[in-house]
Interface confidence: low
């Protein structure tokens, strides 16, 4: 059957180059036109450019034109993107896309590859916990968490209790801080009279930067 | 280039309930136009093209109409693997262009949240940042507003958001907002607040703290 | 104001074929998708045929597929429609179009 898997994201600073593949499988490559289309975080679907099978044409979106170059290697069944002076608004989800063999919409897609720009540098996080008190007390239910505060690029995983809790977790997407560092909070409601016996501790892994944290998160002390 | 609007941008309903999404082209685009179906972390899946043929595989539930400049979705029944965003595509032009999406998220029923803050720890406080948290635990309509006030003076600019995908579960939402300050601007005020306002609350909640107080 | 000119209508006999060409008059039409329509008297114009930019994908009307064939020339700006195994409902005055353009359409007879 018909694949497109992708290669190539990555973080990148601002300014520089970086090239994405899409090896193609299961058709005859040459015969086809494929495009590249993006999706910035939370955002729609943006159409980036495309190559014509018999590589005789490129036709690029305004805001990458001059930018991105579009290349394919019938040889190797790949298509390339070729991103220059790269800026922050093209991160975004890279995906390559075939049409149908007789229409023109995209009927195959690739699993997408994310492209960060940025000028932050790999940071671990800091961990700092979220006590429960009188002030996240609510009927009976207490809440608590960790702020996982200023690390680059995403992502990273949290769990409590090495996984043994999950009931009444919210982790939050992560949001981007003026600084260029990411930041998020993972929360937990567990019964108030459980406090002074369970113990919570959230399980922080930043896997960019080899950094993991376990954190015991407790009633404050007065 | 041809311009696609979608709406609504947001549409919230029940398994069984018939939805339709809307899709507007600024010029005629003839029946050239294809919708595709996106869940959270995955590629885009093509349902429908030439404005009203059904891609192979995908239930005949899933209706396209629609030609010129006007085009609807309409999904006959809805059912649990539908909740996703949908997107048109015209291909008249070769400047593919997309609609900005329409969410199709599940109706849940009026839930109020419950309200919890976070004063900084002292670890953070020895870094020399300060963030406040305000925790809106499982409610619904997604909709809600939080402000922050500092010795009752409203606060601007120094937060920031973040929400939860709806629960699979229950239907609702979760929303974290952080103040975050220098040490030394926290060390200046007493009072830190932050007030929720929900169609779920009869009048807005106030969650407070004394800095230093237990 | 980008033009387009079509040309290689004309009469022909049941079972036979026409080649019909539309030149653009500059490079507008080289990055854009192609179409033929048609119109027959006292119908509505329909879709024939259109191709991609690039040449490279194609698409037919379910009542000329087999038969015709959409093909281009970004060097001469020029888009081709081959017509194979005329039928009399086939005659009708063929327009081509690039993006919000017409040209001003060359007549097809086809002979019983």
């Known amino acids: 059957q018909v694949q497109l898997v992708q290669s190539g994201g990555g973080v990148v600073q601002p300014g520089r180059s970086l090239r994405l593949s899409c090896a193609a499988s299961g058709f005859t490559f040459s015969r086809y036109t494929i495009h590249w289309v993006r999706q910035a975080p939370g955002k729609g679907l943006e159409w980036v450019a495309v190559m014509s099978y018999n590589g005789n044409n490129k036709h690029y979106a305004d805001s990458v034109n001059g930018r991105f170059t579009i290349s394919r290697n019938d040889s190797k069944n790949t298509l390339y993107l070729n991103m220059n002076s790269l800026r922050p608004e093209d991160t975004a989800v890279y995906y390559c896309a075939r049409i149908r063999d007789t229409a023109m919409f995209f009927a195959h897609w690739g699993q997408g590859t994310l492209v960060t720009v940025s000028s932050a540098s790999t940071k671990g996080p800091s961990v700092f916990p979220l006590a429960p008190s009188s002030k996240s007390t609510s009927g009976g239910t207490a809440a608590l968490g960790c702020l996982v505060k200023d690390y680059f690029p995403e992502p990273v995983t949290v769990s409590w209790n090495s996984g043994a809790l999950t009931s009444g977790v919210h982790t939050f997407p992560a949001v981007l801080q003026s600084s260029g560092l990411y930041s998020l909070s993972s929360v937990v409601t567990v019964p108030s009279s459980s406090l002074g016996t369970q113990t919570y501790i959230c399980n922080v892994n930043h896997k960019p930067s080899n950094t993991k944290v376990d954190k015991k998160v407790e009633p404050k002390s007065c | 280039d041809i311009q696609m609007t979608q709406s609504p941008s947001t549409l919230s309903a029940s398994v069984g309930d018939r939805v339709t999404i809307t899709c507007r082209a600024s010029q005629s685009i003839n029946t050239w136009l294809a919708w595709y179906q996106q869940k959270p972390g995955k590629a885009p899946k093509l349902l429908m093209y030439k404005a009203s043929s059904l891609e192979s595989g995908v239930p005949s539930r899933f209706i396209g109409s629609g030609s010129g400049t006007e085009f609807t979705l309409t999904i006959s029944s809805l059912q649990p693997d539908d909740f996703a965003t949908y997107y048109c595509q015209q291909y008249n032009s070769d400047s593919k262009m997309f609609g900005q999406g329409t969410k199709v998220e599940v109706k849940g029923t009026v839930a109020a949240p419950s309200v919890f803050i976070f004063p900084p720890s002292d670890e953070q406080l020895k870094s020399g940042t300060a963030s406040v948290v305000c925790l809106l635990n499982n409610f619904y309509p997604r909709e809600a507003k939080v402000q922050w006030k500092v010795d009752n003076a409203l606060q601007s600019g120094n937060s920031q958001e973040s929400v939860t995908e709806q629960d699979s579960k229950d239907s609702t939402y979760s929303l974290s907002s952080t103040l975050t300050l220098s040490k030394a601007d926290y060390e200046k005020h007493k009072v830190y607040a932050c007030e929720v306002t929900h169609q779920g609350l009869s009048s807005p909640v106030t969650k407070s703290f004394n800095r230093g107080e237990c | 104001q980008v033009q387009l000119q079509e040309s290689g209508g004309g009469l022909v006999q049941a079972g036979g074929s026409l080649r019909l060409s539309c030149a653009a008059s500059?490079?507008?039409?080289?990055?854009?998708?192609m179409a033929w329509f048609r119109q027959a008297p006292g119908k509505e114009r329909e879709f024939v045929a259109r191709v991609d930019w690039s040449g490279g994908s194609t698409e037919y009307a379910d009542s000329v597929k087999g038969r015709f064939t959409i093909s281009k020339d970004n060097a001469k700006n020029t888009v081709y429609l081959q017509m194979d195994s005329l039928k009399p409902e086939d005659a009708a005055v063929y327009y081509c179009a690039a993006g919000p353009y017409w040209g001003q359409g060359t007549q097809v007879t086809v002979s019983s």
């Open positions: 500059d490079r507008y039409f080289s990055s854009h998708t």
